[in-house]
């Protein structure tokens, strides 16, 4: 066990041009606070993954009001260290996220307003017990200067805080099998402390806090005898004595989740869902207050000033859970219509519409013909996010701007001859036919099958089609 300590030295504009605007103003005084989130290993985890090594929230800094016209100076900081206790071994390699938050102190409806000013992240190697390491990180135009270290809490020592030391019981030497605790030569290595409750007869450990079972025993504390009478379970290694499969411990056997947590198996191990007030791999960390930084993903902690009063995490948009540990897939409700793409912008959802659609949810089918004129008397026809012109006779092309040959489609029936004319086409009908397209046969007695030819136009004369 031990403590990771973070000391913020300064937060202000970085070097170079384009200094950021001060986050506070005379109209809107504000103060800063910081949150640190630690994760084991060097893997680049998603920002929303839990702070598995722990998290902490600083106190609020002094109230700051910008002096009009002055550039943003280094901003006043909270007092003291940010401390993140860790229960198990220090991993040696870790990832960190440090967030700088602004608390606006104007007349806010419903209390102060919080907003994230900057977030820096990195991956580092660090041995416990070493000196303070200094660092500078930039986020946009802001610069954060800080130092950090990891130190072991007695009786743990070593670069991983896994060796345990106790004062010597005898002045001259340590007990059997135990070495002196360099550099504390007056102390001795203590035997490993296994998980609390681990059976002293049937369990052992190679790392502090674990409980490994001797053959024939199972359960999180090695208190459950393995039954060899039944060979139905597929789990576990084959028993040398019975030749059948002995049920090995399932990840949730005996419920490793403390304090009323519920266990669910995962592909590699198990996962505990903890009741409010408890967290950690096995829900073993209790008495949580806001000082412990229990809210993930930029959630802000309210209440919980002492271990007996509950804290509440106010989650930022897009996160939920008692510790803001779960990302909400707000797009899963498929709010965008007509094939639009749902975008979760954090503060809001937005739909990016396919061509031809518009509106907050892409619900409007755009008038494809709006502002699209079809030339030469053509009419616009909508459809599928594109527009099409239905052109008047004699014109063609996308916008009816191209002159077409009106006779190309052979419009004159019954062998009539087509003539292009400035106002359209004219059909010269074959004997025995009449009409604009020579579509009507002329009766033998001289009467037409349909309306008589206009005055002054004999059947067989060219008919102008207008």
């Amino acid at each position: 066990a031990g403590v990771f300590e973070l000391q913020i030295h300064s937060f202000g504009p970085g070097p170079g041009p384009g200094a950021p605007r001060s986050p506070c103003s005379a109209r809107l005084p504000c103060r800063l606070f910081f949150r640190v989130c630690l994760k084991p290993g060097l893997s680049e985890e998603a920002a929303e993954s839990p702070c598995a090594l722990g998290a902490a929230l600083s106190a609020r800094g002094p109230v700051y009001t910008e002096q009009p016209g002055a550039p943003a100076p280094d901003l006043p900081l909270p007092d003291g260290l940010l401390q993140v206790p860790f229960r198990d071994a220090w991993p040696g390699t870790f990832s960190f996220i440090i967030e700088t938050w602004r608390e606006e102190l104007g007349d806010q409806i419903g209390g102060p307003a919080w907003s994230l000013l900057a977030r820096v992240a990195g991956r580092r190697r660090l041995a416990a017990g070493g000196p303070w390491a200094r660092d500078i990180q930039r986020a946009g135009a802001w610069e954060l200067r800080f130092s950090y270290r990891a130190r072991c809490e007695p009786p743990a020592v070593g670069t991983a805080c896994t060796r345990l030391c106790r004062p010597r019981s005898a002045p001259s030497r340590c007990g059997p099998g135990l070495r002196p605790c360099a550099p504390l030569e007056d102390e001795c290595e203590a035997p490993l402390v296994c998980r609390a409750g681990c059976s002293p007869e049937h369990g052992f450990c190679e790392q502090p806090g674990e409980c490994r079972c001797l053959e024939g025993w199972t359960g999180p504390l090695c208190t459950v005898p393995v039954s060899t009478s039944s060979c139905l379970s597929p789990r576990g290694p084959s028993s040398a004595t019975t030749g059948c499969l002995v049920p090995g411990p399932g990840p949730c056997d005996g419920n490793p989740c403390a304090n009323g947590g519920s266990c669910s198996e995962t592909p590699r191990s198990f996962e505990c869902t903890c009741p409010r007030g408890f967290y950690g791999l096995r829900c073993e960390v209790s008495g949580v207050t806001c000082a412990d930084g229990p809210c993930f993903n930029g959630g802000l902690c309210v209440g919980g000033a002492d271990p007996d009063s509950a804290y509440i995490c106010h989650c930022p948009p897009g996160f939920q859970g008692s510790n803001c540990e779960k990302r909400v897939d707000r797009c899963s409700l498929q709010p965008c219509r007509n094939g639009g793409l749902c975008l979760d912008l954090g503060h809001a959802l937005r739909c990016r519409c396919r061509a031809g659609f518009a509106g907050p949810r892409c619900e409007h089918d755009l008038d494809d013909c709006a502002g699209r004129a079809c030339a030469n008397g053509g009419t616009c026809v909508e459809g599928g996010g594109a527009h099409r012109c239905s052109c008047a006779l004699g014109f063609g092309g996308r916008d009816c701007r191209e002159r077409a040959d009106p006779c190309a489609a052979r419009p004159c029936a019954h062998g009539g001859r087509c003539y292009a004319h400035f106002s359209g086409l004219v059909c010269a009908c074959a004997p025995g036919y009449m009409g604009a397209r020579c579509e009507f046969p002329v009766h033998p007695d001289g009467a037409s099958a349909l309306p008589a030819a206009p005055p002054g136009l004999r059947p067989g004369d060219p008919q102008r089609y207008l």
Epitope: D329, L341, L343, D344, L345, R352, R354, A355, A358
Partner: antibody, heavy 121, light 107 residues
């Protein structure tokens, strides 16, 4: 560090189909936060978005190319691909693949270095 | 499709100059606009997203502003490595469309 690498033939004959693959390394193509896009740039000209695909296979195309474009994804290989049919000389361009973040704010934050495809007989 | 226009199409400037490039959308696109820098033979690189947010690692001399239809990219003090072509991209609606580009060269 995320890297995208385009691969495919640099010369395609007119009327044939152009096929390119983008291999993503240093990150998973199956993240819910990204679309994976194709953008092209004819020599000496500007940029044109071709289309984008999600790891689940959801696709958006540029309507100006839609009838000729096919985009697919292979999550097991961490790759996505572009096929453009019936190519002409006008399809000669540098083709880029890129990652578009769609959570928080939208933008193409990582690009491949591009591959020149020439359409010529 | 939303049409994007940029002005000027090219400009000549000296190291240390303040340079402003504008981009106009044919319809309102809120702040869904990015600015990209491209050097010859290289892929474009993101400078600004959401009209005014500076991409991580991009020098603070680059800034963006605007919303709706009119947007501006400003380089407060031009450096030798800034001579390149700059494109705006609207990602408000499909199809995503780029501006025609603005080439910044040495005076």
């Amino acid at each position: 560090q995320l890297q995208l690498q385009e691969s495919g033939p640099g010369l395609v004959k007119p009327s044939e189909t152009l096929s390119l693959t983008c291999t993503v390394s240093g990150g998973s193509i199956s993240s819910s936060s990204y679309y994976w896009g194709w953008i092209r740039q004819p020599p000496g000209k500007g940029l044109e978005w071709i289309g984008s695909i999600y790891y689940s296979g959801n696709i958006y195309h540029n309507p100006s190319l839609k009838s000729r474009v096919s985009i697919s994804v292979d999550t097991s290989k961490n790759q996505f691909s572009l096929r453009l049919s019936s190519v002409t000389a006008a399809d000669t361009a540098v083709y880029y693949c890129a990652r578009e973040i769609i959570v928080g704010a939208t933008h193409f934050d990582y690009w491949g270095q591009g591959t020149l495809v020439t359409v010529s007989s | 499709a939303i049409q994007m226009t940029q002005s000027p199409s090219s400009l000549s400037a000296s190291v240390g100059d303040r340079v402003t490039i504008t981009c106009r959308a044919s319809q309102g696109i809120r702040n869904d606009l990015g600015w990209y820098q491209q050097k010859p033979g290289k892929a474009p690189e993101l400078l600004i997203y959401a009209a005014s947010s500076l991409q991580s690692g991009v020098p603070s001399r680059f800034s963006g502003s605007g919303s709706g239809t009119d947007f501006t990219l400003t380089i407060s003090s031009l450096q030798p490595e800034d001579f390149a072509t700059y494109y705006c991209l609207q990602d408000y609606n499909y199809p995503l469309t780029f501006g025609p580009g603005t080439k910044v060269d040495i005076k």
